[in-house]
């Protein structure tokens, strides 16, 4: 049994997968901030988690996916105000009773130290200093991401 949040996440991810056959991104578009191999877009208004997910999708991007603690820290360094929370692309999967990223992978328990409960209708936010479980209906800011395409030197066979 999937929750409405899970269904929304799956639907949007599937529609993204159908439309992601586009040229690689070499530079961050206007308004996006480069952080290593990603482009990040920080909202200045608030939304519940599923609306935030949808907003990122309309921008051919996704809610932020965090690979490890190092990436978390670098992202948190871009957050100026201690009191502001931002949604990321992680929510609680009721069917699998685990934290699940919107790309379908599960949270490695060592990656993020989450404050709060792991339960139905819980979504993950980050602040300048911490990672929180919040009700997905809470209206806070959000972070979208686009992956930059690594520039590889093309190797041509001898002619």
């Amino acid at each position: 049994q999937k929750s409405s949040i899970e269904k929304c996440s799956v639907d949007i991810q599937q529609s993204r997968n159908k439309t992601t056959e586009r040229p690689g991104l070499l530079n961050c578009p206007i308004y996006w901030q480069q952080l290593r191999e990603k482009c990040l877009l920080f909202s200045h208004t608030v939304n519940p988690w599923n609306n935030s997910l949808a907003d990122c999708s309309t921008k051919e991007s996704s809610l932020l996916l965090i690979r490890d603690k190092d990436e978390l820290i670098h992202t948190q360094n871009l957050i100026r105000d201690k009191a502001i929370l931002f949604w990321i692309g992680l929510n609680f999967s009721l069917s699998e009773k685990n934290w699940k990223w919107i790309n379908g992978s599960f949270l490695n328990s060592n990656d993020l130290e989450i404050r709060g409960d792991a339960k139905e209708n819980s979504c993950i936010s980050i602040s300048q200093t911490s990672v929180y479980s919040e009700y997905c209906s809470t209206e806070i800011r959000w972070i979208c991401q686009k992956e930059l395409t690594p520039v590889r030197n093309k190797v041509y066979p001898d002619s």
Epitope: I30, S43, H44, T45, K59, L78, R80, R141
Partner: antibody, heavy 121, light 108 residues
Framework: QVQLQESGPGLVKPSETLSLTCTVS????????WTWIRQSPGKGLEWIGY???????NYNPSLKSRVTMSLDTSKNQFSLKLTSVTTADTAVYYC???????????????WGQGTMVTVSS | EIVLTQSPGTLSLSPGERATLSCRAS???????LAWYQQKPGQAPRLLIY???SRATGIPDRFSGSGSGTDFTLTISRLEPEDFAVYYC?????????FGGGTKVEIK
């Protein structure tokens, strides 16, 4: 409600540097794109560039070699420097808040009243 | 850079009439990131429409925007005396941001 106010000299000599400051009152500088635009007499609008709260900038390529923008978050101010000015830089200079592409209002939603800068010897 | 061409250059109309202003882009405007501004003499531009069709805060519903890709339209359904001004379109989907040359709406 957020208001913007430009300040700086109204007369600059050719080859010198034009310096303007915009003071933001009634709101935070965070997560917006603080922009400079100019309008030459009787002409259209030209985007000069923006500075984000992190300090990252994006300049119009046509002016990039001469433009520097900076931010003083403690004073809620952002600034424009344009070097090696000529008479072609004579214009009304506006500062504005750009909501970018995310949020309730995108684009240039709040403007200062503008300040006329004349380049003349 | 994206060049925006506005037409007509001047529109002569009477109060109560409908005004239709056109903005054409030299290439597709990303995600309809197109805005319209109104400017009166001696004043800064004022945001009317963003995202091609969303009205900015406090803008009367007689102003409406439409279009996508390369062709955009600003419509003023019934001109009020305070609507006579210069109107600019602007794209903000790619850098550098660019403005159209403006359409002057004047009293006939």
């Amino acid at each position: 409600q957020v208001q913007l106010q430009e300040s700086g000299p109204g007369l600059v000599k050719p080859s010198e540097t034009l310096s303007l400051t915009c003071t933001v009152s009634g709101g935070s500088i965070d997560y917006f794109y603080w922009t400079w635009i100019r309008q030459s007499p009787g002409k259209g609008l030209e985007w000069i560039g923006y500075i984000y709260h992190s300090g990252s900038t994006n300049y119009n390529p046509s002016l990039k070699s001469r433009v520097t923008m900076s931010l003083d978050t403690s004073k809620n101010q952002f600034s424009l420097k344009l070097t090696s000015v000529t008479t072609a830089d004579t214009a009304v200079y506006y500062c504005a808040r750009d909501g970018g592409i995310v949020g309730a209002t995108n684009a240039l939603d709040i403007w200062g009243q503008g300040t006329m800068v004349t380049v003349s010897s | 850079e994206i060049v925006l061409t506005q037409s007509p250059g001047t529109l002569s109309l009477s109060p109560g009439e409908r005004a239709t202003l056109s903005c054409r882009a030299s290439q597709s405007v990303s995600s309809s990131y197109l805005a319209w501004y109104q400017q009166k003499p001696g004043q800064a531009p004022r945001l009317l429409i963003y995202g091609a069709s969303s009205r900015a805060t406090g803008i009367p519903d007689r102003f409406s925007g439409s279009g996508s890709g390369t062709d955009f339209t600003l419509t003023i359904s019934r001109l009020e005396p305070e609507d006579f001004a210069v109107y600019y379109c602007q794209q903000y989907g790619s850098s550098p941001l660019t403005f159209g040359g403006g359409t002057k709406v004047e009293i006939k």
